[in-house]
């Protein structure tokens, strides 16, 4: 008897495998099933050759399937959704010439550390590019030029350093753009263009405000009400513009907005200071003592959000007006964590120091690297339920300047994967990410013994993001207790990766529990979680983080 | 013009089992798909099972294991075996026809009772 | 699964009066790939087998006379008889084809006063 789920949604065949322990498709498919979805699923390689017969095939959804390898070697012209994230994918093949139709391509949380410059060739009617929370350091310059059609695209929680230059260019349609939670200190010079860009998340970066950032500061001043911070379970088109959350990582954490450059050379001194052919540079903007120029707010008619992927409430290097307890983001699971010291050099992304070596004094100017480990760290798997560390003593943790809260995970109110009704767990509108069974115990998060003291946040926390480029230290030594460091933060600059001036010392700080396991939003409203590789705090990366 | 006409209902005991048949024509049986609607005596209408032109089967949870649903596209025949009947299960059981891949029923037959009881 | 719930139950008209006929779906029927609303209507006259008034919310079937119209959106639909004639008694059903299992509302009984 075939051991999957069948239904129709909107006139098409619809077939629920999600979590069935296969480890290849299963026998008895429907030659006319137009939504196949495969899910939480062993399947480790798969093939699109296997779906050959599946004419109809519409919708394929191979998320959290353990896929180390995803081979597009077989037709499927009618293929408009494909959902490969929380796999182990490293890279992703040319997906043009097999599938032609594909108008959603999800490949999030997924461990891809470069795309090649051929990757969306022949997608020309691609509408959504999803790559958050992956390893992407750079991108290719001329990547999207086959993809006339994007409308929404998700660069969130990577390591960018840097953006091409003409990469939006062609992208018309493109209403959507998150690139928050990356590694980027500036925009190149004319990057939005002339698009309209009603929703544009950029928090979350070490914005380094010097001459260079002049561009960025003078879009989003232009832009002011297209700028949001992410919300977990809150559509864009939802949640109230933000263009405060874009801040200054090395000058006075102010918002970029405001930075005004005043040492710069202006255009009459022979600088190039041209904003897209803005010419009035003689307004002045309340409370800052520099130029600045009239508002000019785009808006646009496409207005529709992916809440497929939750992104992550509060920006990573600093919120406004807030103290931040900046938590170390992607920690291994290791006896001990390493700590640098407090004697703290400038603030900015330095190389990561390989773990076999001491280590160095490094310079603030230096592109952000992270070495490969030389032996695979030890990660758990896909199905493991998430594990929330024990404190073994009351929190220890800096006092802050600000009211001190204890921040709770928030569950949406609704269940925001499903915009169709009738489809749970089949097909919401364009794609969606297909509902995950509930553990046989919920995971609990065991409150301390003594309330531990935390800075006020406006509301409360998700995960946190990264909070800079990570240095990241990987451990030779397989891992085992959970024990996580938790660094506050007493002034409002922004923590970055110090430079070292002596060598990393190791202790022993248990993590605040209730900060140990914030699952999304998405996971928070099943009562369930994905695998611990999928959240940051058991990540391969160790970042550290002290006060000044 | 589009005939379909039911038959196999009767009386059978709890537990039991019974094949229903419809027969089809005025129409290009293969390349529609059909269904089964019931309605027990005074009440509503409740859909029992669908068959694809492609020939797959779907269900909902009331009948799923229960109910069996199949077609002989050479005989333009529409079939329902149904297992392990219950009281509840007593209706005019209808067969009829989609157009194409829609989910709306277009043309419907006269109906075969079925009665559960002991 | 979608529930759908249709009001009045019953409905006494007088011929060459208008009628009309509401039915709400617990969940929304638009599709907002095609904007289509996959909502049909059935009259089932005294004695015989259901038969198609209109599919996807509006669009009536060959043969069904233009005083039957359908409109609405999302999960509020309406049914409407302009004027109606003493052949049009019966039930009246609506169903969803949004998605499987497909469900009928309660069905709304028209009768002549």
């Known amino acids: 008897e075939f051991i999957c789920e069948v239904s129709k949604v909107t006139s098409q065949v619809e077939v629920n495998c999600d979590n069935k322990g296969l480890k290849a498709l299963p026998p008895g498919l429907p030659g006319d099933t137009a939504i196949l979805h495969l899910a939480e699923n062993p399947l480790g390689a798969f093939s699109t050759a296997l779906l050959g017969p599946l004419t109809r095939l519409a919708q394929l959804h191979l998320r959290q399937s353990q896929l180390t390898q995803l081979q597009v070697d077989g037709m499927l012209p009618r293929l408009e959704t494909l959902d490969v994230s929380h796999n182990r994918l490293k890279s992703l093949p040319s997906l043009g010439r097999a599938l032609p139709a594909l108008t959603t391509l999800d490949a999030s949380f997924n461990e891809l550390v470069a795309l090649s410059p051929g990757t969306l060739d022949g997608l020309s009617h691609l509408h959504e590019l999803y790559l958050r929370g992956n390893k992407l350091k750079t991108l290719p310059p001329r990547l999207l030029a086959p993809t006339a059609q994007l409308r929404k695209l998700n660069l969130a929680d990577n390591r960018l350093t840097e953006l091409p230059p003409g990469f939006l260019e062609g992208l018309g349609e493109l209403d959507t753009l998150y690139l928050q939670g990356n590694w980027l200190r500036t925009v190149p010079k004319g990057f939005f263009g002339d698009l309209l860009l009603p929703f544009t998340f950029l928090h979350g970066n070490p914005w380094s405000c010097d001459c260079e950032i002049l561009y960025l500061a003078r879009w989003l001043r232009d832009n002011s009400n297209n700028v949001y911070l992410w919300k977990e379970g809150v559509e864009a088109k939802a949640t109230t513009p933000n263009v405060d959350s874009v801040r200054c990582v090395n000058w006075k954490n102010v918002p970029v907005h405001t930075y005004q450059g005043k040492d710069c050379p202006s255009p009459m001194d022979g600088g190039d200071m041209d904003y897209d052919n803005y010419d009035d540079e003689d307004e002045k903007l309340p409370g800052v003592e520099a130029p600045a120029t009239r508002a000019v707010v785009s808006f646009s008619t496409h207005t529709k959000a992916h809440t497929t992927h939750w992104g992550l409430l509060y920006p990573t290097f600093a919120y406004p007006d807030h103290q931040m307890a900046y938590l170390s983001s992607t920690l291994e699971l290791t006896e001990k964590q390493t700590m640098f010291p407090s004697t703290l050099g400038p603030i900015m992304p330095t190389t990561t120091p390989e773990p076999t070596t001491p280590p160095t004094t490094l310079e603030p100017t230096t592109t952000p690297t992270t070495p490969e480990p030389t032996t695979p760290p030890t990660t758990l798997e896909p199905t493991t339920t998430p594990i929330t560390p024990e404190p073994t003593m009351p929190p220890t943790t800096l006092e802050p300047t600000t009211t001190p809260i204890t921040p709770e995970p928030t569950t949406p109110s609704t269940t925001p994967t499903t915009p169709q009704p009738a489809t749970t767990p089949t097909t919401p509108q364009p794609a969606t990410t297909p509902t995950t069974p509930q553990p046989a115990t919920t995971p609990t998060t065991p409150q301390p013994t003594t309330t531990p003291t935390i800075p006020e946040l406006p509301t409360p926390p998700t995960t946190p993001e990264p909070t800079m480029p990570p240095t990241t230290l990987e451990p030779t030594t397989t891992p085992t207790s959970p024990t996580t460091t938790l660094i506050l933060s007493e002034s409002n600059t922004f923590l970055g990766i110090p430079e070292l001036t002596s060598p990393c010392t190791t202790s022993e700080y248990p993590i605040v529990p209730s900060l140990v396991h914030l699952p999304e939003a998405h996971e928070v409203a099943r009562g369930t979680s994905d695998s611990s590789r999928n959240h940051r705090l058991f990540n391969p990366d160790l970042c550290c983080l002290l006060p000044l | 013009q589009v005939q379909l006409v039911e038959s196999g209902g009767g009386l059978v005991k709890p537990g039991g089992s019974l094949r229903l048949s419809c027969a089809a024509s005025?129409?290009?049986?293969?390349?529609?798909?059909m269904s089964w609607i019931r309605q027990a005596p005074g009440k509503g209408l409740e859909w029992v099972s669908s068959?694809?032109?492609?020939?797959?089967?779907y269900y909902p949870d009331s009948v799923l294991g229960r109910f069996t649903i199949s077609r002989d596209n050479a005989k333009n025949s529409l079939y329902l075996q149904m297992n392990s009947l219950r009281a509840e299960d007593t209706a005019v059981y209808y067969c009829a026809r989609s157009r194409g891949y829609e989910d709306y029923f277009d043309y419907w037959g006269q109906g075969t009772l079925v009665t559960v009881s002991s | 699964d979608i529930v759908m719930t249709q009001s009045p139950l019953s409905l006494p008209v007088t011929p060459g009066e208008p009628a009309s006929i509401s039915c709400k779906s617990s969940q929304s029927l638009l599709n907002s790939r095609n904007q289509k609303n996959y909502l049909a209507w059935y009259l089932q006259k005294p004695g015989q087998s259901p038969q198609l008034l209109i599919y996807?919310?509006?669009t009536r079937e060959s043969g069904v006379p233009d005083r039957f119209s359908g409109s609405g959106s999302g999960t509020d639909f309406t049914l409407k008889i302009s004027r109606v004639e003493a052949e049009d008694v019966g039930v009246y059903y609506c169903q969803q084809h949004y998605s499987s299992p497909w469900t009928f509302g309660q069905g709304t009984k028209v009768e002549i006063k």
């Open positions: 068959i694809t032109s492609a020939g797959t089967p």
């Open positions: 996807f919310t509006s």
């Open positions: 005025g129409f290009t049986f293969s390349s529609f798909a």
